[in-house]
Interface confidence: low
Amino acid sequence: GELETSDVVTVVLGQDAKLPCFYRGDSGEQVGQVAWARVDAGEGAQELALLHSKYGLHVSPAYEGRVEQPPPPRNPLDGSVLLRNAVQADEGEYECRVSTFPAGSFQARLRLRVLVPPLPSLNPGPALEEGQGLTLAASCTAEGSPAPSVTWDTEVKGTTSSRSFKHSRSAAVTSEFHLVPSRSMNGQPLTCVVSHPGLLQDQRITHILHVSFLAEASVRGLEDQNLWHIGREGAMLKCLSEGQPPPSYNWTRLDGPLPSGVRVDGDTLGFPPLTTEHSGIYVCHVSNEFSSRDSQVTVDVLDPQEDSGKQVDLVSAS
């Protein structure tokens, strides 16, 4: 006859490991008992259990409550046992010794491999600001046995670097994602993907990128200077910028205080009916936590009477 087992049994931490041992005997052969022992190299054999054809399973004190027979129906030639709730310390070599009658004793070894699935964590880098050079966006760490694979899934351009630390029974892998921050990255997902044979599917942790920036400021409203004439109603200047965090706006006049009647409404400066008093240099100051910007424009309120006088002169001169 011959003994059938597996070279390697792989189980995830906390699961039950079936240690197979089946004697395929010739007709008339019987299995008397099956002895299971742990036989790691350099250490003496440590008995797990004895499975007897008549008296059932006897478990050694060190494994009390952890070794069982598979549920029925059982084949009398099957010496397999279940090792409950596998832990990392269970990883190693096991030997099944089958005593048969009349053929004698057979033995086989298997290796138990206990997979420790990683529990990944994602940590952010420093606050991202537009204008920085290559900056750490996030690091992702996963420890398991065997060493997990840590990669990144994102549309954002960047560079990755990984390092591994080996421990006695596991390995920790850390991957860093570096990028050059730009405003287009705001709100983009950066996903750490951890693969491991102990996981049914990849573990994914997503971090939303937040990049602080402040765009250049510009002022709208002076596109047609001819509209800025005495008496005009509803004239306004609007300050344009964008940023993250959203910016605040402040209006001043460079050559004096804001004229009376001029209304400041956030990014908009509203004028009462225009007079020559409204001529001047106006400054829009935009700021957020990240930066500040200024934009200034010169308002020149025209006097239609002066203009028409000039036109008459020109006509008479022609």
Epitope: P120, S121, L122, N123, P124, A127, A138, I205, T206, H207, I208, H210, S212, Q244, P245, E289
Partner: nanobody
């Protein structure tokens, strides 16, 4: 152990207000961006708002801009979401999350907007 405990949900009429709170423990709260997410029945969980570790930077989904305000008190390890001008479409379970580490979630608090 990381724990996030939301409170403040309830039933409110359209146009009304609610203030959600999220008490955090088990980690260095003041070092992390925090966020609010929500999940309406039959829909995927969606981003609502986030706030930087110092509280200076805030971010909002377009659907809540101008109505919701996120804030935090680092001395109390607490995150807030002030919700004004509530609409029926704001009805959902609202979750607090460690934003940078989106696998840590609270249990959620139900917000129902109905007349």
């Amino acid at each position: 152990e990381v724990q996030l405990l939301e409170s403040g949900g309830g039933l409110v009429q359209p146009g009304g207000s609610l203030r959600l709170s999220c008490a955090a423990s088990g980690f260095a709260y003041s070092s992390y961006y925090m966020g609010w997410y929500r999940q309406a029945p039959g829909k995927e969980r969606e981003f609502v708002s986030a706030i930087s570790s110092s509280g200076g930077g805030t971010y909002y989904a377009d659907s809540v801009k101008g109505r919701f305000t996120i804030s935090r008190d680092n001395s109390k390890n607490t995150l807030y979401l002030q919700m004004n001008s509530l609409k029926p479409e704001d009805t959902a379970v609202y979750y607090c999350a460690v934003e940078l580490t989106y696998n840590y979630w609270g249990q959620g608090t139900q917000v129902t907007v109905s007349s």
